[in-house]
């Protein structure tokens, strides 16, 4: 899977979109999870409504919301009041049974608020390292991962 980078400004909202084939994933609930370490599990943050037909209803967990356009095939996640600790690698998932298929891998980067009087050049990454393959950019204040960049620091 390619990784798409979404950049947001600290204190503001960031909207992440995950397109998918609506017929292929028909009837499946969706989820947003946070990757714990490079090879660690993906910890569920929020999932769509228990009733698939009500997937369009926005569900919140803390400052993260999820809503699913099941006909159009777009899962949308909103991270409200973005904070530095929100930076990291996430996944949009499609669920069936206890299985979770990855729809998209997402790297969230948090930029410092330019109106904040602290260093406006700050950018919070989850970590930097040697390489990250198959990076992809989708502009919604987003960019592709640079060559030689990985969302997690190398494990010693």
């Amino acid at each position: 899977h390619n990784t798409t980078v979404f950049q947001g400004v600290a204190g503001q909202s960031l909207q992440v979109s995950c397109p998918y084939d609506s017929m292929k994933h028909w009837g499946r609930r969706k989820a947003w999870c946070r990757q714990l370490g490079e090879k660690g599990p993906c910890q569920r943050v929020v999932s769509t409504h228990n009733l698939w037909l009500l997937s369009f209803l926005r569900r919140w967990n803390g400052s993260t919301a999820i809503t699913d356009d099941t006909l159009g095939g777009t899962l949308t996640i909103t991270l409200r009041n973005l904070q530095p600790h929100d930076a990291g690698l996430y996944q949009c998932q499609s669920l069936h049974g206890s299985e979770a298929d990855t729809l998209r891998k997402v790297l969230v980067e948090v930029l410092a608020d330019p109106l904040d009087h602290r260093d406006a050049g700050d950018l919070w990454f989850p970590g930097e390292s040697e390489s990250f393959e198959d990076a992809h950019v989708e502009h919604s204040i987003s960019r592709s991962l640079l060559e030689g960049e990985i969302p997690f620091p190398p494990t010693s």
Epitope: D21, M23, K24, R29, H96, G97
Partner: antibody, heavy 121, light 107 residues
């Protein structure tokens, strides 16, 4: 109504390959996952894998990776399963089944009549 | 892989009897359990999905129950046409797995 018509019985030699087919009608073939299941004589059922004809994406039971290859032809509404390097262990009836998602998980709702594959010298 | 066990491989009952077929999973399958009927001619039909939901067109004498790892299929009033082999299948985790089957005969 939904129908899954599987190809006829096959008698094949050990080491050879066979390709069996499952022709679907009564629904939009490209939009539903297709399941494949093995049943050895007098034995239970084993899940081989599933394919989404819309884009050819397939998931396999690890036990059948390298043994079975699932493909689909949207123009003829037909799903195929190729079995390679056949041995007597592959002698079985093979079923295709259309998958539906009910209550958040996949269920094989419509089944083909099965194709008997016999591996014998 | 999740193992599905049907301890009774063959069951003999009389017409009109209430028959229960059991199925056990090697771990919790979250009610993602289906029951299938295979007639002597080999045709396979879905009976029950999500533990207890009756598939359309299936007679109401069939019912399912259970949770966690233990599940059962009950035929309330056995009829001649129920002579078949019954398989349970978990749809919780890939690879999907089936029980060994329970063959039901009439005494």
């Amino acid at each position: 109504q939904v129908q899954l018509q599987e190809s006829g019985p096959e008698l094949v030699k050990p080491g050879a390959s066979v390709k069996i087919s499952c022709k679907a009608s009564g629904y939009i073939f490209s939009y539903s996952w297709m399941n494949w299941v093995k049943q050895r004589p007098g034995k239970g059922l084993e899940w081989i894998g599933r394919i989404y004809p819309g884009d050819g994406d397939a998931d396999y039971n690890g036990k059948f990776k390298g043994k079975a290859t699932l493909t689909a032809d949207k123009s003829s509404n037909t799903a195929y399963m190729q079995l390679t390097s056949l041995t007597s262990e592959d002698s079985a009836v093979y079923f295709c089944a259309r998958l539906h998602i009910y209550d958040g998980y996949y269920v094989s709702v419509y089944w083909g009549q099965g194709t008997l594959v016999t591996v014998s010298a | 892989d999740i193992q599905m066990t049907q301890t009774t491989s063959c069951l003999s009952a009389s017409l009109g009897d209430r028959v229960t077929i059991s199925c056990r999973a090697s771990q919790d399958i979250n009610n993602y359990l289906s029951w299938y009927q295979q007639k002597p001619d080999g045709t396979v039909k879905l009976l029950i999905y999500y533990t207890s939901k009756l598939h359309s067109g299936v007679p109401s004498r069939f019912s399912g129950s259970g949770s966690g790892t233990d599940y059962s299929l009950t035929i309330g009033n056995l009829e001649q046409e129920d002579v078949a082999t019954y398989f349970c299948q978990q749809g919780d985790t890939l690879p999907w797995t089936f029980g060994g089957g329970t063959r039901l005969e009439i005494k």
